[in-house]
């Protein structure tokens, strides 16, 4: 059985404020069935950027459709960024249970903000 | 407008247990890990514990073994359970909200807990 | 496990003074220092992060500076609500987190 693998090929994206964020996630397989969730930063205080299970995430939308049979494409959009929005993003998955259990992390993406542009 | 409220200090005797609890506001709080930090009379500050937004749950070296941390989400409520108090306990606990960086940005009020015999 | 090292542990100024508050880490922590402000029966307060960054809300006449393991906070021209107890914390040493035992600004 090949191991699973997170994947988030950019290390680094810059983004002006205003605009949106594109934060790129892929597994190389459906199997073991978990979710998937994305946090901002690596340590216990870790923040919670999105769950696709559960939770209000009024910027943050999926880039495609999580309900589809068969996807392997967990990316994000967050709209509006500000400079608060910078930080290392983590997409991390989980095995279903009671409670999920975390499996595996992808590298991390670096997000930057830039000055709106005058 | 953030809001952690504190409440369940008291007075007990040394060995006995007590439940602190922490009422969040204004934020999405099963977004956030949180903390209890406490202060002792006249010192500084002190970690006691965390849980992360999904559960895992750590302990200061003084604490490991007696206090339990919990957190209801449906209720935006932070607790601990302290539990084989001793004296050495005494202090104003804090319910604090901490970020991704590991900053403590919101503070409750405080709640204080006396073991005395 | 890090150790934070504050000094002095009182320090004495009249408003209008330069207040230079030090923190001491144990070993390197680049620039992952935090610092802190308490009034009397107040929760702490976030003043500064990442050794330089300012809080929101928080007065340019607070700013940090430092690397490694010395670090400092100074306060230009102190103001009267400035006078309390100050804490670095290492950002990132968890768990568990640490804080400086603090510094007291009191009024000369």
């Known amino acids: 059985e090949e191991e699973l693998q997170v994947i988030q090929p950019e290390k680094s994206v810059s983004v002006a404020a205003g605009d949106s964020a594109t934060l790129n996630c892929t597994v190389s397989s459906l199997i073991p069935v978990g979710p998937i969730q994305w946090f901002r930063g690596a340590g216990p205080g870790r923040e919670l950027i999105y769950n696709l299970k559960e939770g209000h995430f009024p910027r943050v939308t999926a880039v495609s459709d999580p309900t589809k049979r068969n996807n392997m494409d967990f990316s994000i959009r967050i709209s509006n960024i500000t400079p608060a929005d910078a930080g290392t993003y983590y997409c991390v998955k989980f095995r279903k249970g009671s409670p999920d259990v975390e499996l595996k992390s992808g590298a991390g993406t670096e997000l930057s903000v830039r000055a709106k542009p005058s | 407008d953030v809001q952690l409220v504190e409440s369940g200090g008291g007075v007990v005797r040394p060995g006995e247990s007590l439940r602190l609890s922490c009422a969040a506001s204004?934020?999405?709080?099963?977004?956030?890990?949180m903390n209890w930090v406490r202060q002792a009379p006249g010192e500084g500050l002190e970690w006691v514990s965390l849980?992360?937004?999904?559960?895992?749950?750590y302990y200061a070296d003084s604490v490991k073994g007696r206090f339990t941390i919990s957190r209801d989400n449906s209720k935006n409520t932070l607790y601990l359970q302290m539990n084989s108090l001793r004296a050495e306990d005494t202090a104003v606990y804090y319910c604090?909200?901490?970020?991704?960086?590991?900053?403590?940005?919101?503070w409750g009020l405080g709640t204080l807990v006396t073991v005395s015999s | 496990e890090i150790v934070l090292t504050q000094s002095p542990g009182t320090l004495s100024l009249s408003p209008g003074e330069r207040a230079t508050l030090s923190c001491r880490a144990s070993?390197?922590?680049?620039?992952?220092l935090a610092w802190y402000q308490q009034k009397p029966g107040q929760a702490p307060r976030l003043l500064i992060y990442?050794?330089?960054t300012r809080a929101t809300g928080i007065p340019d006449r607070f700013s940090g500076s430092g690397s490694g393991t010395d670090f400092t906070l100074t306060i230009n021209r102190l103001e009267p609500e400035d006078f309390a107890v100050y804490y670095c914390?290492?950002?990132?040493?968890?768990?568990?987190?640490?804080f400086g035992g603090g510094t007291k600004v009191e009024i000369k």
């Open positions: 604090a909200k901490v970020t991704w960086n590991n900053l403590f940005d919101y």
């Open positions: 204004g934020f999405t709080f099963s977004n956030f890990a």
């Open positions: 849980i992360s937004v999904t559960a895992t749950t």
């Open positions: 070993q390197p922590i680049d620039s992952y």
């Open positions: 990442n050794t330089v």
């Open positions: 914390q290492h950002q990132y040493d968890w768990p568990p987190y640490i």
